[in-house]
């Protein structure tokens, strides 16, 4: 199926808590974080990044015509292509991954389609043929999701459907200082 893009723009998505939570508060302001509330992470931590957008999952909006052989949609459709980096995970709060984000390697997140939508389009064909209606499946939103053994590479390349399954839970280790109250909920969120 051929397509012609004649307009595109980008939207930065707000990641959902549990999959790819918002950056730590000090990325948004300069307040010192409370160690106890943040799983023992020191204030002014170097895990901050100077440019958050450098590691963001973006929704690129492409406007294109749907084609089917010689036929082309009467109006262009707008769909999303998921683009950008979901890592390094230094942007993830300490609660994710059982507070293990101090490790040198950890969960790999990818920017892939989250939701799809079906859109009905009218195809105009040359030679006076009657218009045809057709349903197309378009990416509606993107999300940073943890890479799992159930992802194959073609899904990632082609922005195919996500088949993630939560990792089997492991017992969290006790911490010397108190962690966030919702840490247990987040521990197996990915």
């Amino acid at each position: 199926q051929g397509w012609q893009a004649f307009k595109n723009d980008a939207t930065e998505i707000i990641p959902e808590l549990g999959e790819y939570p918002e950056p730590p508060p000090e990325l948004e302001n300069n307040k010192t974080m409370n160690r106890a509330e943040n799983g023992g992470r020191p204030p002014h931590h170097p895990f901050e990044t100077k440019d958050v957008s450098e590691y963001s999952c973006r929704e690129l909006h492409f406007t294109r015509y749907v084609t089917d052989g010689q036929c082309r949609s009467a109006k262009p459709v707008t769909e999303l292509v998921c683009s950008g980096q979901c890592g390094p995970a230094r942007l993830l709060p300490n609660a994710i991954g059982r507070g293990k984000w101090w490790r040198p390697s950890g969960p790999d997140f990818r920017c892939i389609p989250d939701r799809y939508r079906a859109q009905r389009v009218q195809l105009l064909c040359p030679g006076g043929a009657a218009p045809r209606a057709r349903k197309v499946r378009l990416v509606a939103s993107c999300k940073c999701k943890r890479l799992t053994r159930f992802h194959n590479q073609s899904e990632l390349k082609d922005f195919g459907p996500e088949a993630a399954r939560p990792q089997k839970g492991r017992k969290p280790r006790p911490r010397a200082r108190g962690a966030k109250a919702n840490q247990a909920e987040l521990e197996n969120a990915y």
């Epitope: 160690r35 023992g40 992470r41 020191p42 931590h45 170097p46 895990f47 890592g87 390094p88 995970a89 230094r90 993830l92 507070g99 293990k100 984000w101 101090w102 490790r103 040198p104 390697s105 950890g106 969960p107 790999d108 943890r146 890479l147 799992t148 053994r149 990792q167 280790r173 911490r175 010397a176 200082r177």
Partner: antibody, heavy 119, light 110 residues
Framework: EVQLVESGGGLVQPGRSLRLSCAAS????????LHWVRQAPGKGLEWVSG????????DYADSVKGRFTISRDNAKNSLYLQMNSLRVEDTALYYC????????????WGQGTTVTVSS | QSVLTQPPSASGTPGQRVTISCSGS????????VNWYQQLPGTAPKLLIY???QRPSGVPDRFSGSKSGTSASLAISGLQSEDEADYYC???????????FGGGTKLTVL
């Protein structure tokens, strides 16, 4: 200049103990998670143990679990590895290493201290 | 035997492009980020690539990393004599609960 300097290595008999130290300078010590990585003569790298910024979360390789203990003293800018029940196969160059960003690899390394376990 | 598998050796001539592979499983590379280290003869290892494809400051852009499924690779373009070293891949292994290294690849610049 960011620096990690290991010490405490030496020749020891099997079954005995040894304590390695790693002194840090040139950076904010508790901004780094710290690790011990070893390299047997002519062999590859083997991760031994890791400890988070505050010393309250620790991981060990199966090969040293129950025998080695990692600890840190942020007030002294020091990392330690207490090695008990040493075996011949523990003979290696022991590196102290640190990572300053989550899931960002070991970006600071010391030059290593040699541990030889032999009778 | 290492959890991550690397070819023991690789070689190339100056200016050439060389790729070093690293094969793992679903419990390490398949789920977690990959890092690459360079160890020049007689020196401590140095971080070359983190988080699959990110370069620390100071590492030339001749070095690049990629990951696909349960394998990762390090590419070195415009090979130079000073690139002659041992290269190691590493990743966290969820089953072993350990940071695992590949066996290392000795790169020779001919």
């Amino acid at each position: 200049e960011v620096q990690l300097v290991e010490s405490g290595g030496g020749l020891v008999q099997p079954g005995r103990s040894l304590r390695l130290s790693c002194a840090a300078s040139g950076f904010t010590f508790d901004d780094y998670a710290l690790h011990w990585v070893r390299q047997a003569p002519g062999k590859g790298l083997e991760w031994v143990s890791g400890i988070n910024w505050e010393g309250d979360d620790i991981d060990y390789a199966d090969s040293v679990k129950g025998r080695f203990t990692i600890s840190r003293d942020n007030a002294k800018n020091s990392l330690y590895l207490q090695m008990n029940s040493l075996r011949v196969e523990d003979t290696a160059l022991y590196y102290c290493a640190g990572n300053s960003r989550g899931y960002g690899g070991l970006d600071v390394w010391g030059q290593g201290t040699t541990v030889t376990v032999s009778s | 035997q290492s959890v991550l598998t690397q070819p023991p050796s690789a070689s190339g001539t100056p200016g050439q492009r060389v790729t070093i592979s690293c094969s793992g499983s679903s419990s390490n590379i398949g789920r977690n980020t990959v890092n690459w280290y360079q160890q020049l003869p007689g020196t401590a290892p140095k971080l070359l690539i983190y988080s699959n494809n990110q370069r620390p400051s100071g590492v030339p852009d001749r070095f690049s990393g990629s990951k696909s499924g349960t394998s990762a690779s390090l590419a070195i373009s415009g090979l130079q004599s000073e690139d002659e070293a041992d290269y190691y891949c590493a990743a966290w292994d969820d089953n072993l609960e350990s940071y695992v290294f590949g066996g290392g690849t000795k790169l020779t610049v001919l």
